[in-house]
């Protein structure tokens, strides 16, 4: 039994870690597997992490965290059985994926704007609380076509835009994820997505 | 309002123990991390110890490693430092703070401890 | 370890001189580094931390900035109540370590 591809492993920068790996041939990665991490130069325990199977040879393991800092560092050591198949180190706050952000809701009783509002995933002593920007995903669920996004770089979780930008008596959908560039993270998985119905007034002609 | 108080500090010969204690009002410790950081005269500032919210991580400086212990009483809403074997370079003044992401937000107002013979 | 020196080490400035301070780390830490003031015989007081947020009741004419190996801390127009000693601490890694310090004094 050997790994095949070394894992790799992002952080929420909050309790979980989760890592992933390819080992050479089928594997149940929960009963002939286990991850043990310890961190460096604190005193504390070494944890075990039972894997899932995740593709045919693939594993995953979800590694509960206490409340990750940003000096963190862990050994990791991938077993099977007495075996000591690879052994690494990970530095959570090196490796961030944000969480989604959540309670995404669209507003339309705003005088002909359409406001978006979301909540940032963090807590507000988390590091990542006052860094996040965000990226709206907003579509037609009629035209394909008609999907756009909208870059968020202030820190309020929130958008404006003028309903008529839009098309008027057509079903859309939004959804948003977040990153935090200083600390150089990965994007978040986009959070759920919301539908409204778009109505606006049109504008009377002048003559 | 947030106020944390050290006390126990004192003169202490070389190998001799003192227990420090930081009792803490404004907020819950087991909510927060807790530090002990100390300053020697004149000198500056030194991060010797620290303990995580759930008490699971705990840190210390090599220079104090297994001779200083850091504990809390979370019904008592107060940290403590143990330190044993002391030394005259652990002359210093000994600072409580309430720690967030390894940033000292609070602080007390710090207690000297003097080791000498 | 990560060692922080801090430049310069005495600064004589006048009330509403613009004062900046560099802490330059020996080897890269993103924006994990904090600022702090202390005032004789008390305990040190956070300003910034996350390398550029300013702490909730700092005034503003303090401001940080920088990543990686070189930060800086600015004061806009200095205050008498600012003549103190100012540490960086790098929050990188494992020992945490202080800068030497800088002692802003009056001219």
């Known amino acids: 039994m050997k790994v095949l591809q070394e894992p790799t492993c992002v952080s929420d920068y909050m309790s979980i870690s989760t890592c992933e790996w390819k080992m050479n041939g089928p594997t149940n990665c929960s009963t002939e597997l286990r991850l043990l991490y310890q961190l460096v130069f604190l005193l504390s325990e070494a944890h075990t992490c039972i894997p899932e199977n995740n593709g045919g040879a693939g594993c995953v393991c979800h590694l509960l965290m206490d409340d990750v800092v940003s000096a963190d560092n862990y050994t990791l050591d991938l077993w099977a059985g007495q075996q000591l198949l690879w052994k690494g180190s990970f530095k959570p706050s090196e490796h961030v994926k944000p969480r989604a952000p959540g309670n995404l809701t669209v507003h339309t009783n705003v005088s002909d704007t359409l406001l978006l509002t979301w909540s940032n995933p963090y807590p507000p002593d988390n590091y990542l609380y006052n860094h996040l920007t965000y990226a709206v995903n907003i579509w037609s669920e009629n035209d394909p076509a008609d999907f756009r996004i909208y870059n968020v770089t202030y820190l309020e979780p929130s958008l404006r835009i003028a309903a008529s930008t839009l098309k008027s008596g057509i079903s859309y959908r939004a959804r948003v994820r977040a990153w935090a560039q200083c600390y150089n993270t990965t994007w978040s998985e986009w959070s759920p997505s919301t539908k409204w119905h778009n109505s606006y007034r049109e504008p009377f002609e002048q003559h | 309002q947030v106020q944390l108080v050290e006390s126990g500090g004192g003169l202490v010969q070389p190998g001799g123990s003192l227990r420090l204690s930081c009792a803490v009002s404004?907020?819950?410790?087991?909510?927060?991390?807790m530090s002990w950081i100390r300053q020697a005269p004149g000198k500056g500032l030194e991060w010797i110890s620290y303990i995580s919210s759930s008490g699971s991580k705990i840190y210390y400086a090599d220079s104090v490693k297994g001779r200083f212990t850091i504990s809390r009483d979370n019904a008592k809403n107060s940290l403590f430092l143990q330190m044993n074997s002391l030394r005259a370079e652990d002359t210093a003044v000994y600072y409580c703070a309430r720690t967030r992401q390894l940033v000292g937000d609070y602080w007390g107002q710090g207690t000297l401890v003097t080791v000498s013979s | 370890d990560i060692q922080l020196t801090q430049s310069p080490s005495f600064l004589s400035a006048s009330v509403g001189d613009r004062v900046t301070i560099t802490c330059w780390a020996s080897?890269?830490?993103?924006?994990?580094l904090a600022w702090y003031q202390q005032k004789p015989g008390k305990a040190p007081k956070l300003l910034i931390f996350a390398a550029s947020t300013l702490q909730s009741g700092v005034p503003s004419r303090f401001s940080g900035s920088g990543s990686g190996t070189e930060f800086t801390l600015t004061i806009s127009s200095l205050q008498p109540e600012d003549f103190a000693t100012y540490y960086c601490q790098q929050l990188n890694s494992y020992p945490l370590t202080f800068g030497g310090g800088t002692k802003v004094e009056i001219r």
């Open positions: 404004g907020f819950t410790i087991s909510d927060h991390y």
């Open positions: 080897q890269g830490i993103s924006s994990y």
